[in-house]
């Protein structure tokens, strides 16, 4: 006669986080008398998941009615699976006996892997703004996914980037994993409206990747170009001088007029005009009373943009 066998037909199962996992186990005999217990892991540190004889296991239900005469099905269902539930589960038959149960026979085990979706990718850029032609780094992070296999891609305005480095942690087995990627992006003057996108593809997402974005408008600083011009005489003793501040970003800008090095007027940019590329233009003018000057006047338009050192452009006004 054959001795009781514990049959776990599934070597492995995969379950999505939040769902229920059914772990199958049947025995071939009703003897010896004694309970079935389920454990996660093997050896002295194994974790009790279910005990037929006693205990309260709120997340575990038996698939069959264990009070039914001749029942040999000891499959269990574990509800609300999380990545922490991953592991190998053993169905173990015990033999009734004093003082402690004697382990009689174990099933071969069923490995439960948990499919957990990655969190929405978070893209962060540099702490300080940078100017065109500079290379800046963007990081992308996503957490809590399982299994470990994951694909991450970077895009700038729909064009895939190639200069990036990606790490998935931890390197060894874990209940869930995190991904961290750093991409290098060269800024151009046209990047105010640009977007950097981090795209994460995982088996749990069923072909619909998650995306995180960063707007380069948060990262770029486009310094202005200045042009100072003298307008035709408006009145006999007055000359109108304009300072054209072009193609700058962001808006924060302060302009100071100097007459022969002396501050004449300071103003903060307002009523800006926006260019198609997202940069701004602004114009300031200064009305100079020529009769107040005996000699030629050096007019300087000095601009402080976004807290950066001032840039300036001068114009010599001839007094005849």
């Amino acid at each position: 006669e054959e001795e009781l066998q514990v049959i776990q037909p599934d070597k492995s199962i995969s379950v999505a986080a939040g769902e229920s996992a059914t772990l199958h186990c049947t025995v071939t005999s009703l003897i010896p008398v004694g309970p079935i217990q389920w454990f996660r892991g093997a050896g002295p540190g194994r974790e009790l998941i279910y005990n037929q004889k006693e205990g309260h296991f709120p997340r575990v239900t038996t698939v069959s009615d264990l009070t039914k005469r001749n029942n040999m099905d000891f499959s269990i269902r574990i509800s609300n699976i999380t990545p922490a539930d991953a592991g190998t589960y053993y169905c173990v038959k015990f033999r009734k006996g004093s003082p402690d149960h004697v382990e009689f026979k174990s099933g071969a085990g069923t490995e439960l892997s948990v499919r957990a979706k990655p969190s929405a990718p978070v893209v962060s850029g540099p702490a300080a703004r940078a100017t065109p032609q500079h290379t800046v780094s963007f990081t992308c992070e996503s957490h809590g996914f399982s299994p470990r296999d994951i694909t991450l891609k970077w895009f700038k305005n729909g064009n895939e980037l190639s200069d990036f480095q990606t790490n998935v942690d931890p390197a060894g087995d874990s209940v869930s994993y995190s991904i961290h990627s750093t991409a290098k992006v060269v800024l151009t003057r046209e990047d105010v409206h640009s977007q950097v996108i981090c795209e994460v593809a995982h088996v749990t997402l069923q072909g619909d990747p998650l995306r995180g974005t960063a707007n380069l408008s948060e990262t770029i600083r486009v310094p202005p170009t200045l042009e100072v011009t003298q307008q035709p005489v408006r009145a006999e003793n007055q000359v109108n001088v304009t300072c054209q501040v072009r193609k700058f970003y962001p808006q924060r800008l302060q302009l100071t007029w100097l007459e022969n090095g002396n501050v004449s007027r300071t103003e903060t940019a307002s009523t800006l005009t926006e260019n198609k590329d997202g940069t701004y233009n602004w114009m300031s003018w200064l009305l100079v009373n020529v009769s107040a000057h005996r000699d030629d006047v050096k007019l300087t338009c000095q601009v402080e943009h976004d807290g950066q050192p001032a840039v300036s452009k001068s114009h010599d006004l001839k007094v005849s």
Partner: antibody, heavy 115, light 111 residues
């Protein structure tokens, strides 16, 4: 589905007897067979259970004098050193207790120990 | 070894009566529920009524019910029928697989 006992009868004190319990309608392979006896006018008394291989166990009072065995269709109870107080109707039943209760019983066979 | 005590040893009742039989274990039965009830009529083999303290065996009328846990158990016949006059035995199991002991029985007689 039934169990049919045989082998009972009159035996002298100190003698031996082997009882048989034949199953029809089901196999004994995955079930324990338990033996219970009832002395005339008395209550039921558990003797032991025959499982598979080493899985046989007996009430403390029955150890040594009672041994059981079984095939897929028949269970046996070997009784030795019989005494007058062993006189009883002997029943076999399918099951091994707890969640495997004694659900099918034989009709019983009378064993009389007397000189 | 576990000891099982049934009370009363006999009870007289009429058809239609509610009858309650008790069984007490000297220590907690295995799993707090290793307790079965059997019915035996004269000249017949016992018949399983209840197992695991409260599970009704297949084919047993629903007027029979079992309850209890640990050391104290009850068999209730909600409305006694003529065929229910018999002797009732409890069988309790201790922690050892061979520790299975019948109570002394309760005879239900016609009043």
């Amino acid at each position: 589905r039934q169990l049919v006992e045989s082998g009972g009868g009159l035996v002298q004190p100190g003698g031996s007897l082997r009882l048989s319990c034949a199953a029809s309608g089901f196999s004994l392979s995955s079930h324990g067979i338990s033996w219970v006896r009832q002395a005339p006018g008395k209550g039921l008394e558990y003797i032991g259970t025959i499982g598979t291989g080493v899985i046989t166990y007996y009430a403390s009072w029955a150890k040594g004098r009672f041994t059981g065995s079984k095939t897929s269709s028949t269970a046996y109870l070997q009784m030795t050193s019989l005494r007058a107080e062993d006189t009883a109707v002997y029943y076999c039943a399918r099951g091994s207790a707890w969640n495997d209760p004694f659900d099918y019983w034989g009709q019983g066979t009378l064993v009389t120990v007397s000189s | 070894d576990i000891e099982m005590t049934q009370s009363p040893s006999s009870v007289s009742a009429s058809v239609g009566d509610r009858v309650t039989l008790t069984c007490q274990a000297s220590q907690s039965v295995y799993g707090n529920n290793d307790l079965a009830w059997y019915q035996q009529k004269p000249g017949q083999a016992p018949k399983l009524l209840i197992y695991l303290a409260s599970t009704l065996a297949t084919g047993v009328p629903s007027r029979f019910s079992g309850s209890g846990s640990g050391t104290d158990f009850t068999l209730t016949i909600s409305s006694l029928q003529p065929e229910d006059f018999a002797t009732y035995y409890c069988l309790g199991g201790g922690d050892d697989e061979a520790d299975n002991v019948f109570g002394g029985g309760t005879k239900v007689e016609i009043k």
